[in-house]
């Protein structure tokens, strides 16, 4: 299964295109953007009505080695007097990236792209009621 | 670059670290997760800090389409209903990373390009109390 | 303790100019953002002109683009909105606020996550 015609435009393959082995693809892992500055956030984490903490994963064996992934602190949400109200539910907010994977086969070496889902932080959310008959 | 372990019976030769360059497989893994958020929940309608998604699409890129989130409003939605502007809606933004096709309109060249994308939204507590 | 004190508001013919000041005080504009937001009867509030000190980035609604300017001087811990070409649709009650939304990407506006409000100033537009 290879990557669709990207938003189904039907690409003029330019003659500087570098030659690419059937079944793969080329790809340059030095990241454009990569020194984008990123400001300290303001603590949204622990301000949030549904608060979260962050846990670092990290896999010699994927670019980038570290994914941070976040986990709501709670089921319900925090209300004004600071106490959790379980009437409404802190859920996970999640996004997808690219990772490369690389993987050894005996003294080979192979690269795979792979989908990781991240989750981002959470949100404070009404829940659905499901009214038995 | 990042050290890779490797079995101790191999030749010295292999680099230990990522290359700049690699040849990757064209399957991508798990690639048919659901990209669509507005399919995949409705929390950005029943949130108390709702979004609107808004499609960015980019044919250099992939994934092409990419759902960008806006809070709704500058307070959040109260148990009647109603904005409070005690409170406020904050957007959640990740960095993630994607291809882009380099050189452009090549069909199977890229880089890997890191973004950063507004996910949806969460209430926050404003760190100093509003004037009365 | 933090005061944000809006002034400048009034009556004036679709067409006309206004010029809004908010002082603040216990508060300075270093590292921080400032703006300007109007919520009309009935309607939500809604954000019309921020700026952040940090790296001077400027937002301005859609609707207020070209007419409205948003300043500040620094020395008197004051920002302005200049309004022109006032348009019946801009009659609303007016507010200044601040807060560190300078956390967030220029494309994002620095209009979020505002700490401090002052009580608001009518402006009201008559066609």
């Known amino acids: 299964r290879k990557i669709p015609k990207v938003g189904h435009t039907f690409f003029q393959k330019p003659e500087s295109c570098p030659p690419v082995p059937g079944g793969s693809m080329k790809l340059d892992i030095g990241i454009i953007n990569e020194n984008q500055r990123v400001s300290m956030s303001r603590n949204i984490e622990s301000r949030s009505t549904s608060p979260w903490n962050y846990t670092v994963t990290w896999d010699p064996n994927r670019y980038p080695s570290e994914v941070v992934q976040a986990q709501c602190r709670n089921l319900g949400c925090i209300n004004a007097q600071g106490k959790e109200d379980i009437s409404m539910n802190s859920v996970p907010i999640q996004q997808e990236t690219l990772v490369v994977r690389r993987k050894h086969q005996g003294c080979s070496v192979s690269f795979q792209l792979e989908k990781v889902l991240v989750t981002v932080g959470c949100t404070c959310v009404t829940p659905v009621i499901h009214h038995v008959q | 670059g990042i050290t890779i372990p490797r079995n101790p019976g191999c030749p010295n030769s292999e680099d230990k670290n990522f290359p700049r360059t690699v040849m990757v497989n064209l399957n991508i893994h798990n690639r048919n997760t659901n990209t669509n958020p507005k399919r995949s929940s409705d929390y950005y309608n029943r949130s108390t800090s709702p979004w609107n998604l808004h499609r960015n699409e980019d044919p250099e890129r992939y994934p092409s389409v990419i759902w960008e989130a806006k809070c709704r409003h500058l307070g959040c939605i109260n148990a009647d209903g109603n904005v409070d502007y005690h409170m406020n809606s904050v957007p959640i933004q990740q960095e993630i990373l994607v291809l882009r096709r380099e050189p452009p309109h090549c069909p199977n060249s890229f880089r890997l390009e890191k973004i950063l994308v507004s996910v949806g939204c969460t209430c926050v507590t404003p760190i100093v109390h509003h004037v009365a | 303790e933090v005061q944000l004190v809006e002034s400048g508001g009034g009556l004036v013919q679709a067409g006309g100019s206004l010029r809004l000041s908010c002082a603040a005080s216990?508060?300075?504009?270093?590292?921080?953002?400032i703006g300007w937001f109007r919520q009309a009867p009935g309607k939500e509030r809604e954000a019309v002109s921020c700026?952040?000190?940090?790296?001077?980035?400027?937002y301005y609604a859609d609707s207020v683009k070209g007419r409205f300017t948003i300043s500040s001087d620094n020395a008197k811990n004051t920002v302005y909105l200049q309004m022109n070409s006032l348009k019946p649709e801009d009659t609303a009650v007016y507010y200044c606020?601040?807060?560190?939304?300078?956390?967030?990407?220029?494309?994002?506006?620095?209009?979020?996550?505002?700490?401090?409000w002052g009580k608001g100033t009518q402006v009201t537009v008559s066609s």
């Open positions: 700026f952040s000190s940090s790296d001077g980035s400027i």
């Open positions: 216990g508060f300075t504009f270093d590292d921080y953002a």
């Open positions: 606020a601040g807060g560190g939304g300078s956390y967030y990407y220029t494309q994002l506006n620095y209009c979020y996550d505002m700490d401090y």
